[in-house]
Each structure stands twice: as structure tokens, then as C-alpha cells.
């Protein structure tokens, strides 16, 4: 979506199918208030942005309300009346789902089921990442709904978990953004902990009878 266009770089993010953010970086026009003109339908007249983002006192982007719009965004970034960059982009290619809400953990011996509120639209993956201080890397599991069961956990270990939502590439294309991660939560023996020790605690010695 970026790429130099007369020195203009563009980024588009469609936040949770609610708000579109288009930002530009135009070195040639760094001290200029470029204007953003847009339409959601090829037949309409262009509207001008009413909610600009500013950087160092100059326009650098636009926020648009676009609730659940399965539309193409036709836009023109202009210096006065001169179009600096004109393009059309299908907005959901740049979807960024919202971070998971109401994350809950349900433990049963060596397994945990992580649930959260499903988003109102589909073709998403809900990813849970987890690790203990003994793990060098995060482990990951994902499902089509926010109901992810992870088995084979060690009840004695402390595990950190976080959850995010991703758009399916075969539906939304390769340029979407994953959601922000949920807050990290730490669990040991089915109980929530403030944190997991950075260095693994040595196993307790077995007491001889």
C-alpha cells in the first residue's frame, strides 16, 4: 500500500470496520498542508476530510467514519488544486480488528480454554500465545472463533498468555494488520498470578518419607 509516489508514501488502516485512517508522508511537501478528498462510490463527488491528523502543525492524515463499509475508497491528496496522489483502494484489505475483549480462562487439569467476545464480522482467526519461563519462544494456537483450548500444560508451571485477532489472508488479502495484543495474564495451578518469574524456579526437592 505504500510505495513512493512523487515522494508520497501512503498508509491505510481500517480499524475494526469502523474508522479508516489514511496517513501520508510527503517529503517534498513537508511544510505544506495537503488536503485529502475522498468518496466511497465512484459516482459521487469528492468530499474533503473534516478530521485531519497533524504532525508538526501540518496535515499528515485523515480519519473517516466508515462503519461496516464493504466499499472502495477513492481518494486524492492535493496541494491546493493540484493532485499529488490519486488512488482507489478496497478498504477491508487494510483491516485491523479490535483487540479481544472479555478474555476468560477456564482450567481443567492440564488444559485451559481461552474465550473472548467474538467480533461482529467473520473470517477471522483468534490467536492465543503462551509461554512459561522455561520456554525460549511463545507457543501459539488459533481458531476461527474465540474459543481456544490448549492441552498438555504443566500444572506446576506458571504460564503467560495473551490473545489477538487476525484477518484471514485468503479472504482479506495479505496487507491486513493483526489486532493489538490483549493484556498479558499469568496463571499457575489454575490461579491468576501477578507475573511469572523471569528465571525458572528450581524444582522443589522431593521429601523422603
Amino acid at each position: 500500500q505504500g510505495g513512493a509516489a512523487e515522494g508520497v508514501q501512503i498508509q491505510i488502516i481500517y480499524f475494526n470496520l469502523e474508522t479508516v485512517q489514511v496517513t501520508w508522508n510527503a517529503s517534498k511537501y513537508s511544510r505544506t498542508n495537503l488536503t485529502f478528498h475522498y468518496r466511497f462510490n465512484g459516482d459521487e463527488a469528492y468530499d474533503q476530510c473534516t478530521n485531519y491528523l497533524l504532525q508538526e502543525g501540518h496535515t499528515s492524515g485523515c480519519l473517516l467514519d466508515a462503519e461496516q463499509r464493504d466499499d472502495i475508497l477513492y481518494f486524492s491528496i492535493r496541494n491546493g488544486t493540484h493532485p499529488v496522489f490519486t488512488a482507489s483502494r478496497w478498504m477491508v484489505y487494510y483491516l485491523k480488528p479490535s483487540s479481544p475483549k472479555h478474555v476468560r480462562f477456564s482450567w481443567h487439569q492440564d488444559a485451559v480454554t481461552v474465550t473472548c467476545s467474538d467480533l461482529s464480522y467473520g473470517d477471522l482467526l483468534y490467536e492465543v500465545q503462551y509461554r512459561s519461563p522455561f520456554d525460549t519462544e511463545w507457543q501459539s494456537k488459533q481458531e476461527n472463533t474465540c474459543n481456544v483450548t490448549i492441552e498438555g500444560l504443566d500444572a506446576e508451571k506458571c504460564y503467560s498468555f495473551w490473545v489477538r485477532v487476525k484477518a484471514m489472508e485468503d479472504v482479506y488479502g495479505p496487507d491486513t494488520y493483526p489486532s493489538d495484543w490483549s493484556e498479558v495474564t499469568c496463571w499457575q495451578r489454575g490461579e491468576i498470578r501477578d507475573a511469572c518469574a523471569e528465571t525458572p524456579t528450581p524444582p522443589k526437592p522431593k521429601l523422603s518419607k
Epitope: 501512503i10 488512488a87 488479502g173
Partner: antibody, heavy 118, light 106 residues
């Protein structure tokens, strides 16, 4: 391997409506791709007509827009072109193609010649 | 509308020649440009997408470059199968093809 196959009448009368259908096989029409129509009049170059997403959103050539209708039928895995008020200038080989996201038209039908004549 | 102008419109060359075709946009299109080879009575064949990315399965003698308004298709060593008409296509804003460059035998 995605395959596309155009079908429809090879002869249309002036002022009538040209109707073509493109059957998609070997891949899901419900994907991140757009489904396109392109034509080539005899002895001329390629002309982009328009495209559709499986949800029904369309993006059409502004110079043809008022005459073009593109629709999709997910259940039949096909999409269609209707071009109204045709004249001899609409005589062309019509191609359907898949517009892979940001990657151009990567799969094409073999093309079908439509002649506008009384 | 964005117009795409290809040069030259016709090019005579021999097998083994290095061939360069240029495409110029009336407005900046970033790198949203494809190149196609089109042979008579066949469907066009995508060679290059996003200005410089080679489509999988396309021979490495084809390469593309450019950004903004100026783009180039290069064939390093022309093969018998390469005598055809070549088109550029912008898909940055709606879509438009160049008028084509016919590569024929010298």
C-alpha cells in the same frame, strides 16, 4: 489451478444488451480476489471494463460506467457482465480474469468474440 | 483518469536481442503496475506485477523496474516465444492498459 470460462451469445443486435457469464473453477470465488472483465476490439488494444468482489462491490471503467453492470453468483461460482445500448464499437473479444490482490490479472479465460450487428 | 503511454508502439528485434519497453503514467501510480505478453488468439499472460515482481513460473529473462510514473519492461535475451504484443496495466486508480507494444521479427 484456477480456470475461467466465458459463455454467452456471439451476436448481439445494435441497441441491445450484451450478456456474458464467466464460470470459475479450481478455486473459490469467495476469496480476496476481484473478478474482472477486459475486452479487445479487432485490431486494437486491451480495455479494462470493470471488476467485482464476491460480496458484490464493483469497480468499473468510468467511461463505460453507465452502461456496465457486473454481478456475482457465489452459489454457482460465476460472475456476469451486462453491457447495454451496444453499438458496432462494442464488437470485441471479451475476457474474464482474476485480479489477484495487488498482483494484476493472473488467470484469464480464453476469450469469446461478441459481434454487434443487425 | 490515469492514462498509460507505451513506447515504442512497434519494435523489430532478433532472437537473443535485449529488448526494453517503456510505460509512462499521466499521474503517479506508486508501483501498482503489471506487464503482460499477448499472443494472437490467446489470453494475455501476466509477466510482472507490482512493477518489479516476477510472476511465479515466468522466465527470469523478464524483469520490470520503475515507480511513480516511469516504468520499464526488459527482456534480456529475446526467445522465439516472445514475439508478441506487450501491455502495461496500472491498477492504482480504477485500471488502464497502455496501448501496447508489438515486438516483431527483424
Amino acid at each position: 489451478q484456477v480456470q475461467l470460462q466465458e459463455s454467452g451469445p456471439g451476436l448481439v443486435k445494435p441497441s441491445g444488451t450484451l450478456s456474458l457469464t464467466c464460470a470459475v473453477s479450481g478455486g473459490s470465488i469467495r476469496s480476496s480476489n476481484w473478478w474482472s472483465w477486459v475486452r479487445q476490439p479487432p485490431g486494437k488494444g486491451l480495455e479494462w471494463i470493470g471488476e467485482i468482489y464476491h460480496g458484490g462491490t464493483t469497480n468499473n471503467n468510468p467511461s463505460l460506467k453507465s452502461r456496465v453492470t457486473i454481478s456475482v453468483d457465489q452459489s454457482k461460482s460465476q460472475f456476469s457482465l451486462k453491457l447495454s445500448s451496444v453499438t458496432a464499437a462494442d464488437t470485441a473479444v471479451y475476457y474474464c480474469a482474476r485480479h489477484r490482490y495487488s498482483s494484476g490479472l493472473d488467470y484469464w479465460g480464453q476469450g469469446t468474440l461478441v459481434t454487434v450487428s443487425s | 483518469d490515469i492514462q498509460m503511454t507505451q513506447t515504442p508502439s512497434t519494435l523489430s528485434a532478433s532472437v537473443g536481442d535485449r529488448v526494453t519497453i517503456t510505460c509512462r503514467g499521466s499521474h503517479s501510480i506508486s508501483n501498482w503496475l503489471g506487464w503482460y505478453r499477448h499472443k494472437p488468439r490467446k489470453a494475455p499472460n501476466l509477466l510482472i506485477y507490482k512493477a518489479s515482481s516476477l510472476k511465479s513460473g515466468v522466465p527470469s529473462r523478464f524483469s520490470g523496474s520503475g515507480s511513480g510514473t516511469e516504468f520499464t519492461l526488459t527482456i534480456t535475451s529475446l526467445q522465439p516465444d516472445d514475439f508478441a504484443t506487450y501491455y502495461c496495466q496500472q491498477y492504482n486508480h480504477y485500471s488502464t492498459f497502455g496501448q501496447g507494444t508489438k515486438v516483431d521479427i527483424k
